[in-house]
Amino acid sequence: LIIGFGISGRHSITVTTVASAGNIGEDGILSCTFEPDIKLSDIVIQWLKEGVLGLVHEFKEGKDELSEQDEMFRGRTAVFADQVIVGNASLRLKNVQLTDAGTYKCYIITSKGKGNANLEYKTGAFSMPEVNVDYNASSETLRCEAPRWFPQPTVVWASQVDQGANFSEVSNTSFELNSENVTMKVVSVLYNVTINNTYSCMIENDIAKATGDIKVTESEIKRRSHLQLLNSKAS
C-alpha cells in the first residue's frame, strides 16, 4: 500500500495505491483511491507511467480526456466513471502486455487539493493448476498441469503424510512454450504416490503462487486449487 500526499499548494489530499500484477492477455486493474470530493466537475485523474511520454489516461470534468494519451495505451484504458465521485480512481487496463510492467503514478486534483501515489505493476502469466491421477502410468502417478505461466516458475510437491519430505527425486517437471511464444504450460508428474494421502503441487514465480491439492482414497478423489498474487502491497 502506498499512501501519497499532495506537496504543492495550500492543501493536500491523500491518495492510496496498491501494487498489483497483471495476467498477460487478460484485463488488469491498477488500484487507486483518494479522499472523495462532492464536486465531480472539479476532479481530475491522471495516470502516468515512468518512461512513457504521453499520459496513460486522463479523466476530467466528468469524462475521459484522451488527447494526450500515449499510443501504447490507446483503446486499452478506462476508469470506473460512476465510482470517481466516491474516491475511486482505479484504472482498468485491457489486454495486459508484458511491456505494461513498470512504475505508474496516480495523480489527483480535486477542489480540496492535490495528491499522488506511485504503484508498481508487474506483468506475467499465472494460472490455476489441476492435479489428476495419471491412470496411463505403470505406477501410481499424479499429474499437475497449469496452462499459462511466465516467468518460468518453480514447482514443488508436498504431502500431508510425509511433511517436509523432498519429492524432487520422484517428480519430473517440464515447461512447454505456448503458441504466442511467451507463456509456458507447466506439467509436473509425481511418481510412487500412496493412497489415503493428500498431495499438493505448488507452482510459484515472483508474481504468483498457486497450489493444486488432491486427496486420493479408496473410494474417492477430492481436488482443490488456490491462487495468490504475491506483491499486493499498498502505498
Epitope: 479522499e35 472523495p36 462532492i38 464536486k39 465531480l40 466537475s41 472539479d42 470534468e61 466528468g62 469524462k63 466513471a81 460512476d82 465510482q83 465521485i85 466516491v86 474516491g87 477542489s111 480540496k112
Partner: antibody, heavy 117, light 107 residues
Amino acid sequence: EVQLVQSGAEVKKPGASVKVSCKVSGYPFTSYWMHWVRQAPGQGLEWIGAIYPGKSDTEYAPKFQGRVTLTADTSTSTAYMELSSLRSEDTAVYYCTSTWTHYFDYWGQGTTVTVSS
Amino acid sequence: DIQMTQSPSSLSASVGDRVTITCQATQDIVKSLNWYQQKPGKPPKFLIYYTAQLAEGVPSRFSGSGSGTDFTLTISSLQPEDFATYYCLQFYEFPPTFGGGTKVEIK
C-alpha cells in the same frame, strides 16, 4: 448492513435552533461525505449541505450558509445538523444521506421538524 | 446552479403500462445523474445511478438512459408497487440539485 438512524421529531418556536443527529453503521463513516437534504410538506427535495467527517470539511448550499452548521463525532459515527433562526418555512422532514458507494445511496428514516408559534 | 426540469410533474397510468419520465439539465452534466423513488412518509429509495446503472435489488423493468442534458427513466411494465414519486439528481456540479419530481398515480 448499512444503517443511518436519525433522532426523533422536534417542535420548535420561530427564532429557535434545532439539532438533528444521524448515527451511521455498516461503512467507514470518516472516509465518505455525509449529506443533509430536506423536504417541506408536499414539496420536492432540497440539498442543505455535506460534511466529510475525516477532516470535518463542510460544504453548504448558499441558501443555508450562515444558518446551518454540520458537525460529526467520529468516535460514535454520528453526524449532526444544526439549523438556527428557525422560521415557519423550515418546517420539513430532514434527511441524512450517505455517499458511500454512490451519491445519496443510503438514507436515514427522516426527522420531522415543525416550527410553530 | 444547475436547474433540473422534470416532466411531466404527474401522470396517471395503469398496471402494465410503459412509463417514461424525463429530466433536463440547464447545462451538460455528462452522465452524472441518479434517479430516486419516494413513497409517502418514506425516505427516497436509490434506484438508478450514473444515468443507466441499476442499484442493487432494483427490478429490471426500470431503466435509465441519456447523456449531456437530456435523461430518461423508463418503467417497461408498471407494477402496483411502482406508484410513487420519482426524482432525478445531478451531482456533476456544486451544489447537487434535484428535479421537481414526477408523481405516478393509478389511472
